[in-house]
């Protein structure tokens, strides 16, 4: 069975084809080659001499037990080598010779017992080394690491490391890898020698499910003293053994580290009062809790130095009381509990993501809700009922506003967006909005993107509601049950490039409403009920139009509509997916492609 | 279609068939077997994925006695610092994991429950596997 040609001469997918040897019938020019799940078993010298251009080579689960000297010798352009799941027993000292451009080496689950004997010291270009899920017991970084000056990611998770000693990291003192991210999760740690990490600088350190008791966790964290880390991730996994106890003493040792960003990722423990727990983290710039259960978040001090707070997939007893002076970004998403939003005081806030929480808002939106006048980005999508009671007073800096799939109330009672003259992006898709007021978009003079799919209009008629949106480039009006539109609805949209009118209830097509759209490139009228044209004589669409989608409509392929069908044929160079433009009537022509029809009609006298 | 038996409990019998062409082997054990009236136990999965599990989600298509419920999307792995350790599993890496579950207080009517589980992962998204579970529910007379 041949390999699948994904990109001709470049990418070949040869997965699980029962190959016992490297195929020799692929082009020399091949750059990406997936040979995974083939029983190759043995890689001899110059195994890949036929593929000098290879950049990515996937040898996952190839039952490889032996890799000889120079197996990859010809692969001077190879940047990624994947060896996951091979039961390697014999790895020659020169196994990886010739890989002068290798940046990523994945040797997950390869029976590797030690880094010391791993022959990679010459791979100077290596950026990422993944040796997770192996049998490594010692964390001693061999001397050859001093050659790996580009190393950015070292994944040692799911190994057998129990202790870390001062000598293990000596090589990092000799050549500090300023950008190294280290993952030690799922190693059964019970001892970190104090001073082992003194004056070590890491970009990221991940320690999840490393400790089998609170005491071990405390002493190991104390052993990290002196570490300077940009991002520290602690926590557990839901499907692994979890700590039975967790209290405020757990993280006391963090006071002796220099941390820029902190994340606690999953904790199978109910946290009541978290203020003391994070005492040592009041001055990190970014603080993140993921999948943590917290009874109350009331006690964060206004003076905490956090600039970014992230609370994701957590459970709360009530919506947190957030009053933080320095906070610039707040991400509060996919959380449970506290279903009603309550006022926050975040005077420096510029970015606020409150999506996917099922929250209800008794009033929206005003600077008093968020305690800031600096907000530029606001995402309230996928929430509950949001009652529009104020037109964004004090929030005039907003540039991005997303309400999609929330239930907006009182949208047609006043000009909700009147203050938002800087807004560039607005999404009110699927918000149960019924447009019954022509001033709904007044004030949005800078708006470039408007998404309002899945809403409805009074009498299923699109009125002149876009008159002030002179900078609009993208407009989505799909799934709005529209049947008719004002001939002048789009007259002011001279910058519009994309217009989506799909999934509505239009029965006829008219070019007149689009005459002013001098920049229009894409017009989508798919999934309507278009049978014919509104007027006998259809004009041309704007000359800028490049794509016209009329698929899945109800074309009437009869003589009375001959001129319309001919007009469609004349637009052939604009039409997309023409094979999905089929006749709906009459019954004898149902399902036939519209463009293949040859309708010759005679006038019956 | 070969049917794979999972387990029997006092009020349910659980089995599955593959609903994809690939039919890559997957081993599923539930201990103790699920009782629909109330259950707490461990789900053990042994599997060698054909693609990375990063950004894994399930599409669930549930049928209750021939009535189709709306499709449900259950995100399992978001892509970074995920809840489950297997979210970091790579293509070809052994996934051998035990997940605890519990639910209570759900009253199910007698009958045949079908659940098609479409596992989708990676970027670009592709199907990892598809299993159709059948649960025959016979509520206890007591």
């Amino acid at each position: 069975e041949p390999c699948v040609e994904v990109v001709p001469n470049i990418t070949y997918q040869c997965m699980e084809l029962n190959f016992y040897k490297i195929p020799d019938n692929l082009p020399f020019s091949t750059k990406n080659l997936d040979l995974s799940f083939n029983p190759l078993r043995h890689l001899g010298s110059y195994s890949f001499f036929s593929f000098p251009e290879l950049q990515v080579l996937d040898l996952s689960r190839c039952e490889i037990q032996t890799i000889e000297d120079g197996a990859y010798q010809s692969l001077s352009h190879l940047s990624t080598l994947i060896l996951t799941g091979n039961p390697i027993q014999s790895l020659a000292l020169g196994a990886f010779s010739g890989l002068s451009s290798l940046q990523k080496l994945v040797a997950v689950e390869t029976n590797l017992a030690s880094l010391e004997n791993f022959p990679i010291g010459h791979l100077k270009t290596l950026k990422e080394l993944n040796v997770a899920h192996n049998l490594i017991q010692s964390f001693k970084l061999p001397e050859y690491f001093s050659n790996l000056t580009n190393l950015e990611h070292l994944d040692l998770s799911s190994n057998k490391i129990q202790s870390i000693y001062c000598t293990d990291l000596r090589v990092l003192h000799q050549m500090p890898l300023l950008n190294l991210s280290l993952d030690l999760s799922l190693n059964p740690m019970n001892f970190i020698q104090p001073g082992a990490f003194k004056e070590i600088r890491l970009h990221k350190l991940t320690l999840r499910n490393n400790f089998d008791s609170l005491n071990v966790m405390k002493t190991c964290i104390q052993g990290l003293a002196g570490l300077e880390v940009h991002r520290l991730v602690l926590g557990e996994f839901r499907n692994e053994g979890n700590l039975e106890k967790f209290d405020k003493s757990a993280l006391e040792g963090l006071c002796n580290l220099t941390i820029e960003e902190f994340r606690l990722a999953y904790l199978d423990y109910y946290l009541d009062d978290i203020i003391d727990l994070f005492n040592c983290l009041t001055n990190v710039s970014s603080f993140s809790l993921v999948s943590v259960t917290i009874e109350r978040v009331k006690d964060f001090s206004y003076n905490f130095g956090w600039q970014h707070l992230e609370l994701v997939n957590c459970k709360f007893g009530q919506f947190p009381t957030l009053k933080l002076k320095s906070l610039k970004r707040l991400t509060f998403t996919s959380n449970k509990g506290g279903n009603a939003f309550s006022e926050v005081d975040l005077p420096s806030l510029e970015f606020l993501d409150l999506s996917r929480n099922g929250l209800s808002f008794k009033g929206c939106c005003s600077q008093s809700d968020f305690g800031t006048t600096s907000l530029k980005y606001l995402d309230l999508s996928f929430n509950g009922v949001i009652t529009m009671s104020s037109n964004f007073l004090g929030l005039e800096q907003l540039e991005h506003l997303d309400f999609q799939h929330s239930n907006l109330k009182q949208m047609s009672e006043f000009s909700v967006f009147l203050s938002l003259r800087n807004l560039i992006y607005l999404d009110i898709s699927h918000t149960h909005t019924r447009v019954a007021f022509n001033g709904i978009f007044n004030g949005l003079s800078s708006l470039e993107v408007l998404k309002m799919a899945g809403n409805s209009f009074q009498e299923n008629f699109l009125p002149d509601i876009f008159t002030e949106l002179r900078n609009l480039t993208f407009l989505d009006l799909s799934q709005c049950q529209l049947e008719q539109l004002s001939p002048t609805a789009f007259n002011s949209l001279s910058s519009l490039q994309v217009l989506n009118m799909s999934h509505n209830n239009f029965f006829s097509l008219d070019t007149f409403p689009y005459k002013c759209l001098n920049s229009l490139q894409v017009l989508d009228y798919s999934l309507n009920h278009i049978m014919t044209s509104k007027k006998q004589e259809l004009q041309h669409f704007p000359s800028s139009l490049a794509f016209l989608n009329l698929t899945q409509n109800d074309f009437a392929c009869t003589c009375e509509h001959q001129s319309f069908l001919q007009w469609i044929k004349d637009q052939r160079q604009l039409l997309v997916e023409v094979e999905r433009m089929e006749c709906a009537t009459p019954s004898d022509k149902q399902g036939m492609p519209v463009l293949s029809l040859n309708i010759t009609c005679q006038m019956n006298k | 279609q070969k049917q794979y038996w999972v387990c029997n409990s006092s009020d349910a019998s659980i089995s599955y068939t593959y609903c994809d062409k690939m039919q890559y082997p997957i081993s599923i054990n539930v201990n103790p077997c699920i009782e629909l009236k109330r259950s707490k136990g461990l789900l053990h999965i042994f599997y060698i994925p054909r693609r990375d599990l990063k950004q894994l989600y399930f599409n669930l298509y549930i049928t209750v006695n021939t009535m189709n419920l709306p499709k449900r999307k259950e995100v399992i792995c978001r892509g970074s610092d995920d809840d489950y350790s297997f979210c970091r599993a790579l293509k070809g890496e052994t996934v051998n994991t035990t997940i605890s579950f519990s639910f209570k207080g759900i009253k199910f009517s007698k009958g045949k429950y079908k659940c098609v589980v479409e596992a989708i992962s990676g970027s670009p998204e592709e199907m990892l596997f598809c299993l159709e579970f059948v649960i025959l529910h016979q509520p206890n007379s007591n």
Epitope: K323, K362, C364, L393 | -
Partner: antibody, heavy 118, light 107 residues
Amino acid sequence: QVQLQESGPGLVKPSDTLSLTCAVSGYSITGGYSWHWIRQPPGKGLEWMGYIHYSGYTDFNPSLKTRITISRDTSKNQFSLKLSSVTAVDTAVYYCARKDPSDAFPYWGQGTLVTVSS
Amino acid sequence: EIVLTQSPDFQSVTPKEKVTITCRASQSISDHLHWYQQKPDQSPKLLIKYASHAISGVPSRFSGSGSGTDFTLTINSLEAEDAATYYCQQGHSFPLTFGGGTKVEIK
């Protein structure tokens, strides 16, 4: 500049209903914030009574919940307090105020004294 | 509800002297505590929010400190115009509550 001004009768009979209005200038009461009533019996401390949010939502001190109503007239940009079944202990200076997201009160009316007496 | 206890109730102080007023909360309120000054026949005026943040326009001799349950308002060098009653107020949870007040008199 936000300004608040209380008005209403200075004398109310016991068991009657006390009614006060707070006229707001310099900011729309539907534009944001919550608008509160606070009282101070002669020679005593301050007691928070309740508020009306810019959305129209109201909440009250549990000690007054059965007797208090707060409403608004958006056309006049004012909000009102009604306290039913008053007794002598309700004699106080009544203040209206605007609360900040900090839950502090930077803006107050000048206060109006209401005496409950027959 | 959270009870705020102020002490002393009354203080008689000579000009230029330092004045210290304390406010104790019945439970931890982080730093969600504010201080007001009220002169006779006037409405209260906000001096300090979040325990230590001075409101603009308030003289620098007024400062606040504390967190949790114990808070202090300090007037560094008392002036005649500072004769007033000072109140603390918690913004930690509803119902919002005030302390009983401390009257500062000039000797």
